[in-house]
Amino acid sequence: SEVEYRAEVGQNAYLPCFYTPAAPGNLVPVCWGKGACPVFECGNVVLRTDERDVNYWTSRYWLNGDFRKGDVSLTIENVTLADSGIYCCRIQIPGIMNDEKFNLKLVIKPAKVTPAPTRQRDFTAAFPRMLTTRGHGPAETQTLGSLPDINLTQISTLANELRDSRLANDLRDSGATIR
């Protein structure tokens, strides 16, 4: 049976998996795959390590910890609803049927929408593609995405709107900048 982990759309998902190397540097191959662990190997491999290195990975999938110390937890960057499903972490211990298998069920929830102050709501309604957030976890940062295609008059109006608004303070406090 699989164990459930949760993340929100746009966040990074963390799927923990560990093993204890028999001795320092005595690593065993590990694979991560989308779908439940089959009898052998991993199906739909997204990341693989061998006795020395991470030798295969796909974009958005990476190991956050030090796999040389047995931390083979998977991070999936900027998840979407399509990332939902079961993932297999397989520790490929030498010998017949010695592998350790972990089936982890990732449940992706829609991003929480928090009510904003009136001024900010007016602003984001006028420029809906401007304000976005990226990142997850302790190092979460807030950034501004690309400005929509607007003319100089609109930018000037926008600057005036921002000057003494609460949003301007929020943006300054968060270290975000307008690009």
Epitope: V3, P24, G65, D66, K69, G70
Partner: antibody, heavy 117, light 107 residues
């Protein structure tokens, strides 16, 4: 034989800082995560943080962020815990431990820190 | 943070008894749970890792079970040397957290 030898007891004044050491023998600290754990009298165990001596990367419990700094010197096979702005709440036994990778398989003998004027 | 709620906080049992200590995690930690024994005036010692794996040199009367959020440490045929405080610890998420401890006494 794996051993973690910690520095001796410390008596320090409030407001001061202190640096505790943990010297490993029987293994190379670069191959493990090194942790520090706090235990006050009649209290449980509290995880302070850890370091990956291989690259210096650290993780701290939020409670100890700004209070504790963990470092490591791989040439002397030693991990350090520095505690700043000391108060009576910091009076405790501090243990170093290594992890493999998520559990603590070997512990130091502990260093007693007393903060008193 | 993941809270680890351990019960009971203290326990009195007779030699030869079988006792059970439970640990409940506030969220899923799969099997990434360890148990430690700390005898009076001594350092903590690892008993069990990955919820049920016995650490080298630990007597077989100690056993662990459970997964996800519920875990138990069982000591069968209690011995005088088992007088100690026992702690659970989760190692899945930072910050790592310990249970409050269970102090075991002999009747």
């Amino acid at each position: 034989e794996v051993q973690l030898q910690q520095s001796g007891a410390e008596l320090v004044k409030p407001g001061a800082s202190v640096k505790l050491s943990c010297t490993a023998s029987g293994f190379n600290i670069k191959d493990y995560y090194m942790h520090w754990v706090k235990q006050r009298t009649d209290h449980g165990l509290e995880w302070i943080g850890r370091i990956d001596p291989d690259n210096g990367e650290t993780k701290y419990a939020p409670k100890f962020q700004g209070k504790a700094t963990i470092t490591a010197d791989t040439s002397s096979n030693t991990a350090y815990l520095q505690l700043g702005s000391l108060t009576s709440e910091d009076t405790a036994v501090y243990y170093c431990a290594r992890s493999s990778p998520y559990y603590f398989d070997y512990w130091g003998q502990g260093t007693t820190l007393t903060v008193s004027s | 943070d993941i809270q680890m709620n351990q019960s009971p906080s203290s326990l009195s049992a007779s030699l030869g008894d079988t006792i059970t200590i439970t640990c409940h995690a506030s969220q899923n930690i799969n099997v990434w749970l360890s148990w430690y024994q700390q005898k009076p005036g001594n350092i903590p010692k690892l008993l069990i890792y990955k919820a049920s794996n016995l650490h080298t040199g630990v007597p077989s009367r100690f056993s662990g079970s459970g997964s996800v959020t519920g875990f138990t440490l069982t000591i069968s045929s209690l011995q005088p040397e088992d007088i100690a405080t026992y702690y659970c610890q989760q190692g899945q998420n930072f910050p790592y957290t310990f249970g409050g401890g269970t102090k075991l006494e002999i009747k």
